[in-house]
């Protein structure tokens, strides 16, 4: 056989009707978004402009405080993350609705979801933080008394975004601009290529740094407080009671998602059905995360109100009652004078 | 029968220009799009580019960019490649190579069925 | 771009042997797709390249049932259960998932 039996393959299929656009080729599924998608960009919208005006607000409130004020340097820290990420979302909204069309460049690439993931990890890290602040503040009282000052908070605080960036880097140095040949389209993405056990940790440490610590140090510091707090029959046992249901409920109800695929997708091959199905559902999974951005203001407004009776006040004088009330470190009222400290907590962000 | 006819051999100075042509019969011109990939012996094979003859959208190899001109005339079902300012590099064997636009899961332009016989190029002063 | 190497660089076999080519990508394949766009062509001696494999493992019209291609995601085998006299050429690994579209350097199978 000096040449193998070439015939015209069947095209029968094929018809004039199918021929493509032909000056911009588009694959014919990819001209209408995915339910999924349109549910994140929806989610989006309403996380940027919640997320940017309340936290730039809470920033304005909390940043004459911060001095003098300790809940004031952790909220002005999570505000600023939180702010920072929903800075970010105008880009991953454009790339959405492009079908994941990335136009920005490969340092961009590298740099903006990155930044975002750092906002992400700053954010988390801030609430184990502030978690063991409410800690000490119930159990160590006296310590806190003697030590407690707003230059432990600011190195405190450097230490979560350190921590938080040293998190970040390997998504970095993974992070690449992919351009599809056909349809014709740049992705902007992680490929780990060769290392998927370097992909499965990263995974993994993602998912304890990021989620089960953070999840389990709100858990035992709010188990431990609670009991405290319920054996000196505290007045505000049961709306603290709610505050800390809401936290960790909501830890659970936004990042769960986020995390979950994460992991399952660094254990599956990348052309299998259900990594297909799962890759489908990340945007939605990151959106939903995203709402820990903007929800802390929403929080914070509604505690105020919750205080006030009525919403009497105007909001930067009523976020500034909620936001920059110092505790009252004593022994025999170790909880705080205000349970918003408490809610405070709320902040899960990405 | 599907073909895709190449032109003859070309011996050029360096710093000329050249248009190379495939002329191709036996099935929809417009339909199909046509790739351009340069063999050099001993360096295998480079893609040059692609034409979509039915719209004149082309897409280039960043490296071939300023090099090569590709377009087609749908009247002959011909497509073409002209290489500009022509340099000792430049001396390869030139192909020509369809690539169907079928639809259906996964299917697309993605590989090259038939080939042209190809086109000597040679660089000389 | 996309780095495709191919192992070995020159494969010399007898008739009726088995002979395996490896190929392998400098990043993922796996388009967003989730398909992976890897061809296989023989070039054979004087001749254009003739299209073997297409997408990992499918053979094209008229390519004999001996050639077999697997793998997936950066790692490609293509394999000839059985080789005749008219399988002598270079074999070339290509890839159609990025931009710009690149090949293997080749392999020559040749007989003993």
């Known amino acids: 056989m000096d040449s193998f039996n070439y015939t015209t393959p069947d095209y029968g299929h094929y018809d004039d009707k199918d021929t493509l656009d032909l000056n911009t080729p588009v694959d014919k599924t990819s001209n209408t978004l995915r339910v999924p998608d349109i549910l994140a960009l929806v989610i989006f919208a309403v996380v940027f402009l919640v997320g940017v005006l309340g936290n730039a607000l809470v920033v304005w409130v909390t940043a004459f405080e911060a001095k003098r004020t300790i809940n004031a340097i952790w909220f002005l820290n999570l505000a600023v993350a939180d702010f920072l990420s929903c800075l970010a979302l105008p880009i991953l909204f454009t790339s959405i609705v492009q079908h994941h069309h990335w136009p920005f460049g490969g340092a961009a690439c590298s740099i903006l979801p990155s930044l975002i993931l750092l906002n992400m990890y700053a954010s988390i890290l801030l609430l184990a933080t502030i978690s063991a602040d409410r800690f000490l503040l119930v159990f160590k009282p006296i310590w806190c008394q003697n030590f407690r000052g707003a230059g432990l908070a600011w190195i405190a605080c450097a230490v979560a975004w350190g921590l938080a960036l040293l998190l970040t880097i390997p998504s970095f140095l993974y992070r690449v601009v992919r351009e599809e040949y056909f349809p014709p389209k740049v992705l902007c993405g992680v490929d780990y290529s060769h290392d998927k056990r370097r992909e499965r940790a990263v995974a993994i440490v993602r998912l304890v740094l990021g989620f089960l610590w953070p999840l389990l140090t709100l858990t035992i510091c709010y188990t431990f407080i609670l009991l405290r707090t319920w054996s000196r029959r505290a007045t505000r046992s049961t709306k603290t009671l709610k505050v800390v249901v809401a936290v960790v409920a909501s830890f659970f109800i936004f990042w769960l998602p986020y995390q979950v695929t994460g992991i399952m997708m660094s254990f599956l091959e990348p052309s299998s059905p259900t990594f297909l199905l799962l890759k489908k559902l990340d945007s939605l999974c990151v959106s939903f995360a995203y709402i820990n951005c903007c929800i802390n203001p929403i929080i914070y407004v509604v505690a105020g109100q919750g205080f006030q009776g009525r919403l009497r006040k105007s909001l930067p004088s009523l976020l500034r009652n909620v936001l920059t009330e110092e505790s009252v470190v004593r022994e025999s009222k170790s909880f705080t004078r205000s349970t918003v400290d408490t809610m405070a907590q709320k902040t899960q962000a990405v | 029968q599907v073909q895709l006819q190449q032109s003859g051999a070309e011996l050029a100075k360096p710093g000329a220009s050249v248009k190379l042509s495939c002329k191709t019969s036996g099935y929809t011109f417009t339909n199909y799009w046509m790739h351009w990939i340069k063999q050099r012996p001993g360096l295998g094979l480079e893609w040059i580019g692609y034409i979509n003859p039915s719209g004149d959208y082309t897409k280039h190899n960043q490296k071939f960019k300023d090099k090569a001109t590709l377009t087609a005339d749908r009247s002959s079902s011909t497509a073409y490649m002209q290489l500009s300012s022509l340099t000792y590099e430049d001396s390869a064997v030139y192909y020509c190579?369809?690539?169907?636009?079928?639809?259906?899961?996964?299917?697309?332009?993605?590989?090259?069925?038939?080939w042209g016989q190809g086109t000597t190029l040679t660089v000389s002063s | 771009d996309v780095v495709m190497t191919q192992t070995p660089l020159s494969l010399p076999v007898s008739l009726g042997d088995h002979a395996s080519i490896s190929c392998r990508s400098s990043q993922s394949l796996v388009h967003s797709n989730g398909n992976i766009y890897l061809h296989w062509y023989l070039q054979r001696p004087g001749q254009s390249p003739k299209l073997l494999i297409h997408k990992v493992s499918n053979r094209f019209s008229g390519v004999p049932d001996r050639f077999s291609g697997s793998g997936s995601g950066t790692d490609f085998t293509l394999k000839i259960s059985r080789v005749e006299a008219e399988d002598v050429g270079i074999y070339f690994c290509?890839?159609?998932?990025?931009?710009?579209?690149?090949f293997g350097s080749g392999t020559k199978l040749e007989l003993k």
């Open positions: 190579a369809r690539v169907p636009l079928s639809y259906g899961s996964g299917n697309g332009p993605y590989y090259f069925d038939y």
């Open positions: 290509s890839q159609s998932t990025l931009v710009p579209l690149t």
